[in-house]
């Protein structure tokens, strides 16, 4: 019986000769469990596994812990890939994280972290980041050191309040902190003075809700 080729991430897909952006089936490390992910084969040499996308407000991001764990949405549109898969993947080898942002005035910016991983569920998928470069602010809009992940039904933040309820969406909230790319989607002309919107403070400030965001990861040695 012919052995089926499995891909761990989009870098594997790219290396196999499949260099067209689109949805591919990836396999969890050391497992037969599969997930579908959008592979960006164009940005900066390709091989990027997309772990989050916001673009039009079509998907509700005010989800439960379990939904953020397994992922939701459509990989070709708005989605969250899933904390469990990302945690397992980023603990196998060193990954970089690129966050691409777009505002309502047509400006684009990015933040690139040279080392990114998520702790296991036992440690609430805490985010770990090192080495920030990019155009979306000299200071990290994801609080450092990294925080545990919080959702509407799992309050792991450092605020007396429940940040995920107050600001909506699952995120690595501090108290509540300078970012939330999973906040409420606000259309143009309703996107300012929105403290529960899609926020990246060190690029656009407190009350500005972004038009589009993409979070993607790739092995550091790609």
């Amino acid at each position: 019986k012919e052995e089926q080729i499995t891909f761990r991430d989009c870098a594997d897909v790219f290396r196999s000769g499949l260099t067209t952006s689109g949805i591919y089936t990836l396999t969890f490390p050391n497992s037969t469990e599969e997930t579908k992910a959008y592979c960006d084969m164009e940005t900066g040499g390709g091989g990027w596994t997309t772990i989050q996308r916001r673009e039009d407000g079509s998907v509700d991001f005010q989800r439960t812990w379990k939904e953020y764990k397994v992922g939701f949405g459509n990989p070709s549109g708005e989605h969250w890939l899933g904390n469990e898969f990302v945690s397992q993947l980023t603990n196998q080898q060193r990954y970089v994280l690129k966050i691409h942002l777009r505002d309502w005035e047509g400006n684009e910016a990015y933040s690139l972290y040279e080392h990114f991983y998520l702790s296991s569920e036992e440690f609430n998928y805490r985010i770990h980041l090192k080495g920030l470069t990019g155009t979306a602010g000299k200071i990290s809009s994801i609080s450092q050191p990294g925080n545990d992940f919080s959702t509407k039904d799992a309050d792991n933040d450092k605020c007396i309040c429940k940040c995920s309820q107050m600001l909506t969406g699952g995120w690595w909230f501090d108290a509540c902190g300078p970012s939330n790319l999973n906040g409420m989607y606000y259309p143009q002309r309703q996107n300012t003075n929105k403290f529960n919107g899609i926020k990246w403070y060190y690029w656009k400030g407190s009350g500005y809700s972004l038009k589009a965001t993409t979070m993607m990861i790739r092995p550091a040695d790609f």
Partner: antibody, heavy 121, light 107 residues
């Protein structure tokens, strides 16, 4: 200690402008948002807007949009609120206040002493 | 804008009395409510934030409770220095708004 000291009382004619200052001390000025709140004689409190001294970002209550401008001078740790086209119902005590957070406009933990602005012909 | 309806608008009480002030929000504000005390000719002073957390230095006789739309400020045993006007404030939604105030007067 943390303190906000505002400029003195003003008397203005209808149609004129007023600029109130608020000098901060005892903390890192760019680490907290500043808000402006006014209180008409014998009335309650009304939020006018905020400014983020870190990046100059502002957000104004729609009621004052187009008439109010909030600015800061980080070199002197001073916030300013200018209100234009004054009317008699703008007669009020104007307060600056610090928010407890840079990233959100939460509650207000430190207040200036207030500046009485009287609009009268 | 979210309306914050405070009641009563005034209350007469004696030293040692228990005083309760309520605030009702026109929509859910979670626990994003603060309470301020204001004395004549003075700036407001923060007492309570996140509905029930006392600010530094605020006496324990002041307590806050509530979530969603209904909030309460309680002064367990009124002291002479507590005669003032009290305001609730929601900061869950833009723009932040205040209640109309409750004047606590000497009976």
């Amino acid at each position: 200690q943390v303190q906000l000291v505002q400029s003195g009382a003003e008397v203005k004619k209808p149609g004129a402008s007023v600029k109130v200052s608020c000098k901060a001390s005892g903390y890192s000025f760019t680490d907290y948002n500043m808000v402006w709140v006014r209180q008409a004689p014998g009335q309650g409190l009304e939020w006018m807007g905020y400014i983020d001294p870190y990046n100059g970002g502002t957000g104004y209550n729609q009621k004052f949009e187009g008439r109010v401008t909030m600015t800061t001078d980080t070199s002197t740790s001073t916030a300013y609120m200018e209100l234009r086209s004054l009317r008699s119902d703008d007669t009020a005590v104007y307060y600056c206040a610090r928010t407890r957070d840079r990233y959100d406009v939460w509650y207000f933990d430190v207040w200036g002493q207030g500046t009485l602005v009287t609009v009268s012909s | 804008d979210i309306q914050m309806t405070q009641s009563p608008s005034s209350v007469s009480a004696s030293v040692g009395d228990r005083v309760t002030i309520t605030c009702k929000a026109s929509q859910d504000v979670y626990i994003a409510v603060a309470w301020y005390q204001q004395k004549p000719g003075k700036a407001p002073k923060l007492l309570i934030y996140w509905a029930s957390t006392r600010d530094t230095g605020v006496p324990s006789r002041f307590s806050g409770s509530g979530s969603g739309t209904d909030f309460t400020l309680t002064i367990s045993s009124l002291q002479p220095e507590d005669f003032a006007t009290y305001y609730c404030h929601q900061y869950s939604s833009y723009p932040p708004t205040f209640g109309g105030g409750t004047k606590v007067e000497i009976k």
